[in-house]
Each structure stands twice: as C-alpha cells, then as structure tokens.
C-alpha cells in the first residue's frame, strides 16, 4: 500500500452566515494522525504514535498550515450562492500518495453538505464534477471564486501538491511510520446461534500495519470463503487497526475449529472456549 | 506449564482387558481434544482416534474400531484408553496427544508400554 | 488413507552440519504437514506445523519447507539435542498418517 496524507477540513454555515472555526483532521497511512483543537487552536496529535513521528519538534508548522486551510475554506464557502436557511457543510478533502516505486498522486475533493461536487487532480489540475445539476452549479460557483482568488493560480496547485508531498516525506523520515509492527491481539468468543449452533468470532485488534489474515480452519483445513463473515479492517483510534472474522458451527463441534492469524510474519492459531468453566489444575 | 502425565506400565495376558490413562495438567481439559496413537516396537507412529473432551464422543481410525475404547473423567481432567480382548499384536507404546483444533498433536504425554504375552 | 513415506529411514551427520530430511506424500496434501521430533527416551514434541511454521519454543535452527506432496525439515546447524528421530504427519485427510520416521545419529 503507497503511504499517504490525508487532510479533512470542515466548515458549517448557518442561515447563510458562515461560523467562526472549522474541523480538521489530518491521517497519515490511513490512521488518524492530527486534529486541530478548537478550543486551544492548536493542531494536536492523535496517540503517542503520533507525537513519536516528530518526537520533541513543535506543531506550530501544522497548526500554521491548517489554520490557513480553514480560513480559506471558510471564504470558499461564502462564496456558495446555494445558501438557505439551516445548517450547511462544506468539506474539503485533499490526499497525497507516495507508491512503492515513488511515483506520486495528489488530489482534492469538495464536499457540499457531505455531497461531492467538485474533484480535482492536482498533478494534472484536471477537475471532475458529477454529473446532477445541483454539482454543476456549486462546483461552478467554487471555481468561478477560485479563479477570481489571486492565490488560487496554477503555481499554487503546483504547491499545495508540493506541500503535501513534503509534509508526508517529513512524517516519513523519522522512520517511526515505516518501522513500526505492532502485533494483533486475538480473542476468540462465542455466542449462541439457532438451536444447535453457535457464532464463534475471532477479533485482532491493536495491530500495525493493516495487511492481516485472519481465517477459521476446521480441522486444520481452511473453510471456503462463503461460510465465513468478515468485518473491514478499521482504525481502533489508537493509531492501530482492528478487524474480526466469524462463522456458526454446531455446538459441540468447538474442538474442531481454530481461528488462524498471520500478520507481518507472524502467526498464530486461537482455539474455541467450550463454553464449560474448569478449574485450572497445576502440577506440583 | 502443560503436561499430560500417563499411567505406568502394563504388563498382560492375551484376552485380558487393559486401562490406560492420561492426566492433563495446566490448561482447560474440555476445550481440547486427546488423540490416542501407538507405536510399535522400533516402529513409526499410528494414529488411533481421538475423544472430543466437551461431549464425550469418540472417533477411531478404522484399524481400531471394536476392541478400543476412549472414555473420560471430565472432574478429574483424565482420558482413558481401554482395550479388550489384547492380542500380541497390541504390545506397543501408547501415548495420549493433546489435539489442537484436530489437527495438531502439540503436547504429548510420555508414553504407556503395554506388554502382551501368550 | 494418504501414505506418507520417509525413504530415509535414518541418518548419519556432524554436528555442526546442515541436516535435511525428507517426507513425501501418496497425494497432494496442500502443505496440510506437520513435523515432531521423537527423543531417544521416547519424549515427543511438535516441532513445526503447516509446513514450515515454527513452534512456540522451538529453535530457529529447525525449519521446514514443501509443496504438493514433497515436503522437508531442515536443521541448520546440528546440535547435540538434535539426535533423535523425525516424524511428518498429514493432516489434509482423516485419518491422519505419519511417515515411518528418520533417525539422526551423530557421526
């Protein structure tokens, strides 16, 4: 997977008027990374993994960078004339990609009212609209004001990409993204299911990076994919991911089944709880 | 740490019933299986079945459906292998397996010598 | 029944020596393999299962490797303990089967 930026700016009007601050969130690799408090202004890292990235360095560049991007997406927003009474969204979302033969991709994407109406490639500055009318008018009036914005010219595309690429090669380099392996934790549960059967599930979590497999074997043998249920594999909060597999077996059956992990070289196997409490015995 | 611990020695005579058993130490007795596997002597290693330990219900390889029987004491963490009816083809070492999701023998006990004699 | 035969039946090697011993099934078991290890006392202990992935507890030295019906053990570099005798065992079908075993002396 290429490693990537990504930026999430919010801001909200209401009755037409647009309100003072804005939402941010920046994720680095899929995790999130920085968000910009409200109440201290500050960009402000998400975990001890986060702040590792740039260990004792300040956020002031980061807090600097995204205060500017949420004052010009709330100028941006003025400027829609699809203004009505209510609450109202504009989200702007921009992505930078570095690929394992360092090819690079950037892009930025508009969101009106969590709709997308506007896209752009800022490599090739090419821009892409959906096709409904109500995109064709809201990406016309956005454009028409980043035209009109001096700032908004093709060297400024050129830096935004620029920018972005630069800010994720910094990440980079401290070496804490690229190094880090945090091993799964694996719990296997079971619940009852129909008469006769119960839903065993095994859930990783806590794991870095994402590539994981996680399968149910019976009798040592892997089951077909059909008889199997997945969860995506999903950011746990913690700069870590979390997934779970499960499938229904017939009660009793429990000692036949294993769940088997594999996650950066590593492996394991988790048996099935038979549902009966045991005192441990230990020998002397 | 784990450890399935197995009765001594026996020594018999054709015809004669034996008992054999197998104690497990250190973990969760009903949330594995035990495989039961012979070898013979100076020879490799069969595999004779094994008892899910949460229902009790045993399942042999054909070479040992008849005169062989897997039982269990839940309470006391104990399996049991019984044969009936011993031949001489039945002097062996008999060895209790944990069963791993039921296709792993990854702890063993030390081993059961059975001698049957005419 | 799958037949799994181990055409070596023992071997001789130094320690220090790279050992390899061999295990190939009657048909495709889908890297469905196990290895053991059986000590002169008569001791048994998994050493690797599916193939090549290691034991908790077992020493880098051993690993395994196969596919299809042909499948192997390596020990890197022999040790004393390694003298015993060697056992792979299918687990692609019921019943399970083990080859004949592979003992390992020291020259």
């Known amino acids: 997977e290429p490693h990537s930026l990504r930026y999430n700016l919010t801001v909200l009007s209401w009755d037409g008027s647009v309100q003072s601050g804005f939402l941010a969130e920046v994720h680095l690799d899929g995790q999130p990374f920085l968000r910009y408090d409200r109440q201290k202004c500050r960009a402000k890292p998400q975990g001890q993994w986060a702040e590792d990235v740039l260990g004792n360095k300040t956020w002031d560049r980061e807090t600097r960078d995204l205060t500017g991007n949420g004052k010009d997406l709330r100028m941006t927003l003025a400027h829609i004339k699809d203004q009505k009474e209510g609450l109202h969204s504009l989200q702007e979302i921009r992505v930078c990609e570095i690929h394992e033969d360092n090819s690079t991709r950037s892009s930025q994407h508009f969101y009106y009212d969590g709709e997308l109406f506007l896209s752009q490639n800022l490599e090739t500055e090419e821009w892409t609209v959906p096709q409904s009318s109500r995109a064709q008018t809201l990406a016309m009036n956005v454009r028409n004001f980043l035209k009109e914005d001096a700032m908004k010219t093709k060297t400024h595309y050129h830096a935004m990409h620029a920018d972005c690429l630069q800010e994720l090669r910094r990440y980079l380099e401290s070496g804490v993204v690229l190094r880090r392996t945090v091993p799964p934790m694996v719990n296997v549960t079971r619940s009852e299911a129909s008469e006769g059967n119960i839903t065993v599930t095994c859930r990783a979590s806590s794991f870095y990076p994402r590539n994981i497999i996680l399968t149910w074997r019976q009798d040592g043998v892997s089951l077909s994919h059909d008889t199997q249920q997945w969860g995506d594999v999903l950011p746990d909060g913690n700069g870590t991911y979390q997934t779970w597999v499960a499938t229904r077996i017939c009660r009793g059956e429990e000692q036949r089944f294993t769940c088997y992990m594999e996650h950066s070289g590593n492996h394991s196997t988790h048996p099935v709880p038979s549902g009966k409490v045991l005192v441990l015995q230990s020998h002397w | 740490q784990i450890q399935l611990v197995q009765s001594g020695p026996e020594l018999k005579k054709s015809g004669e019933t034996v008992k054999i058993s197998c104690k497990a130490f250190?973990?969760?007795?009903?949330?594995?299986?035990m495989n039961w596997v012979k070898q013979a002597p100076g020879k490799g290693l069969k595999w004779m079945g094994w008892?899910?330990?949460?229902?009790?219900?045993?399942t042999y390889a054909d070479d040992f459906k008849g005169r062989f029987a897997f039982s269990l004491e839940t309470s006391a963490s104990t399996a049991y292998l019984q044969i009936n009816h011993l031949k001489n083809e039945d002097t062996a070492t008999y060895f209790c397996?944990?069963?791993?999701?039921?296709?792993?023998?990854?702890?063993w006990g030390q081993g059961t010598t059975l001698t049957v004699s005419s | 029944d799958i037949q799994m035969t181990q055409t070596t039946s023992s071997l001789s090697a130094s320690l220090g020596d790279r050992v390899t011993i061999s295990c190939s099934a009657s048909q495709g078991i889908s890297n469905y393999l196990n290895w053991y290890q059986q000590k002169p006392d008569g001791t048994l202990k998994l050493l690797i299962q599916y193939t090549s992935l290691l034991h908790s507890g077992v020493p880098s030295r051993f690993s395994g490797s196969g596919s299809g019906t042909e499948y192997s053990l390596t020990i890197s570099n022999l040790e004393p303990e390694d003298i015993a005798t060697y056992f792979c065992q299918q687990y692609s079908k019921f019943p399970r089967t083990f080859g004949g075993g592979t003992k390992l002396e020291i020259k």
């Open positions: 008892i899910n330990t949460y229902t009790g219900e045993p």
């Open positions: 397996a944990r069963n791993y999701g039921n296709y792993l023998f990854d702890y």
């Open positions: 250190g973990y969760t007795f009903t949330n594995y299986g």
